[in-house]
């Protein structure tokens, strides 16, 4: 009679993570008598996957009933496959022996490859905010995918970016891989509403790429422009001075009025108006009693925006002259006001 052969018909099997892998194995003879065992890997460090004779293998089921005397199908199914299950599986026939069974013949092996989806890309921006015209870096990370081939693209508001570097790790063979990409983005004053998108395409995603986003509102700081103007008032001895704080983001802003270098009032921006580009405007009024001043008054509007060093704009108030409109003739924008009278 022809000597028993162990047939593993599939050289390779490709399974998606979470699915069940079927590893086929048949013997050509019932002789010699003895159990079948499945191993992952070869040599002394091989890992036992299934033993027909004894042991508990909760993830493994047999395709046919191995208790039947004439059974020659030793195929198994491994459930809930993960990338860690990847490797070459060997179906090995043992001959009954005393005290231990003896390895008789091995199949040629079946390589199990696991297709694993990449994790949702996580996009992170710089730790500190940056101002327009500065270049900032964004990173995108995705993990746990297999096979290694993957495509990553960057977009800003739908426009593809080209200034980025991408690495897939590890370089050699692995059960799963990670991708890390860094993109450089130049900020503009209009970027409060902008988004940066990292898009990952992989064979497991069936043409539906994964996206991670970052809002540039978390990254950008648009410094305010200040304008101090003197408004005409009805009362002869009172002058209304306004400080218009325009086009700033984020909202965190403290304004201080100084009269001849002395603090008159500080207030935090609360009732702001929002521009179409996402920046804010705010207006603060200071009502100055001119009769209380014998000399000219230097009024300073000082603004501390988003934890940055203070910026200021000054206006010289001539007390000798009759109060009249001075300063900019720029039309006032639709801004909120925060009026407090100072006497």
């Amino acid at each position: 009679e022809e000597e028993l052969q162990v047939i593993q018909p599939d050289k390779s099997v490709l399974v998606a993570a979470g699915e069940t892998a079927t590893l086929r194995c048949t013997a050509t003879s019932l002789i010699p008598v003895g159990p079948i065992q499945w191993f992952r890997g070869a040599g002394p460090g091989r890992e036992l996957i299934y033993n027909q004779k004894e042991g508990h293998f909760p993830r493994v089921t047999t395709v046919s009933d191995l208790t039947k005397r004439n059974n020659m199908d030793f195929s198994i199914r491994i459930g809930n496959i993960t990338p860690a299950d990847a490797g070459t599986y060997y179906c090995v026939k043992f001959r009954k022996g005393s005290p231990d069974d003896v390895e008789f013949k091995s199949g040629a092996g079946t390589e199990l490859s696991v297709r694993a989806k990449p994790s949702a890309p996580v996009v992170s921006g710089p730790a500190a905010r940056a101002t327009p015209q500065h270049t900032v870096s964004f990173t995108c990370e995705s993990h746990g995918f297999s096979p290694r081939d993957i495509t990553l693209k960057w977009f800003k508001n739908g426009n593809e970016l080209s200034d980025f570097q991408t690495n897939v790790d590890p370089v050699g063979e692995s059960v799963s891989y990670s991708i890390h990409s860094t993109a450089k983005v130049v900020l503009t004053r209009e970027d409060v509403h902008s988004q940066v998108i990292c898009e990952v395409a992989h064979v497991t995603l069936q043409g539906d790429p994964l996206r991670g986003t970052a809002n540039l509102s978390e990254t950008i700081r648009v410094p305010p422009t200040l304008e101090v103007t003197q408004q005409p008032v009805r009362a002869e001895n009172q002058v209304n001075v306004t400080c218009q704080v325009r086009k700033f983001y984020p909202q965190r802003l403290q304004l201080t009025w100084l009269e001849n270098g002395n603090v008159s009032r500080t207030e935090t921006a609360s009732t702001v108006t929002e521009n179409k580009d996402g920046t804010y405007n705010w207006m603060s009024w200071l009502l100055v009693n001119v009769s209380a001043h014998r000399d000219d008054v230097k009024l300073t509007c000082q603004v501390e925006h988003d934890g940055q060093p203070a910026v200021s704009k000054s206006h010289d108030l001539k007390v000798s002259a009759h109060p009249k409109e001075q300063g900019s003739n720029t039309a006032a924008e639709n801004t909120g006001s925060n009026e407090r009278n100072i006497y």
Partner: antibody, heavy 115, light 110 residues
Framework: SLEESGGRLVTPGTPLTLTCTAS????????MGWVRQAPGKGLEWIGI?????STSYATWAKGRFTISKTSTTMDLKMTSPTTEDTATYFC?????????????WGPGTLVTVSL | AIDMTQTPASVSEPVGGTVTIKCQAS??????LAWYQQKPGQRPKLLIY???KLASGVPSRFSGSGSGTEFTLTISGVQSDDAAAYYC????????????FGGGTEVVVK
């Protein structure tokens, strides 16, 4: 980590410079601050040096203290200490390039101003 | 200028109890508030920032709430290790400020 040095016993009016040294931390991209604590008292803010090098001080500290920095150190110069300046002085790093919260603190250095 | 007022100055609570510390800003600081813990002879430690976000490694029994001018630090199920001084700090602005910190609250655990 951050570590303060330079704290010692000085007589009133003797200028003193405290140094905050960073190891494994780059100070150039962060705002830094000095905070002090008199014995048995609460925390008292002295001032900030922004990532760009600008400074801002507590109203009571203007003219009495000067803050400067390099990429790895920050100095606090006490121009003319008084007995009221006896305290433990902490340096701390903010979470960003501007003023916000103190993310990292040094262990403190004790300054005693006494006749 | 923004002034920070912290209450109470001292509080005593048995193990397992709840400690509540309040902090009031003289004007709106949105959510720009942090809480620090300081044990005797040690440096302060950031507990909570942005009024309610837990700093890295801080136990979940610490929580922060509030916005605008009124803020609260709560220690639920207080433990003996929580005995310390606690300080609030406004992170909004520093121009013409006398002190960015509240006066502190001493927590005694019985």
């Amino acid at each position: 980590s951050l570590e303060e040095s330079g704290g010692r016993l000085v007589t009133p009016g003797t200028p003193l410079t405290l140094t905050c040294t960073a190891s494994g931390v780059d100070l150039s991209n962060y705002a830094m601050g000095w905070v002090r604590q008199a014995p048995g008292k609460g925390l008292e803010w002295i001032g900030i040096i922004y990532a760009g090098g600008s400074t801002s001080y507590a109203t009571w500290a203007k003219g009495r203290f000067t803050i400067s920095k390099t990429s790895t150190t920050m100095d606090l110069k006490m121009t003319s200490p008084t007995t009221e300046d006896t305290a433990t002085y902490f340096c701390a790093r903010h979470r960003s390039d501007g003023y916000d919260y103190f993310h990292l603190w040094g262990p403190g250095t004790l300054v005693t101003v006494s006749l | 200028a923004i002034d920070m007022t912290q209450t109470p100055a001292s509080v005593s609570e048995p193990v397992g109890g709840t400690v509540t510390i309040k902090c009031q800003a003289s004007q709106s600081i949105s959510s720009w508030l942090a809480w620090y813990q300081q044990k005797p002879g040690q440096r302060p430690k950031l507990l909570i920032y942005d009024a309610s976000k837990l700093a890295s490694g801080v136990p979940s029994r610490f929580s922060g709430s509030g916005s605008g001018t009124e803020f609260t630090l709560t220690i639920s199920g207080v433990q003996s290790d929580d005995a310390a001084a606690y300080y609030c700090q406004q992170g909004y602005a520093v121009s013409y400020v006398e002190n960015i910190f509240g006066g502190g609250t001493e927590v005694v655990v019985k």
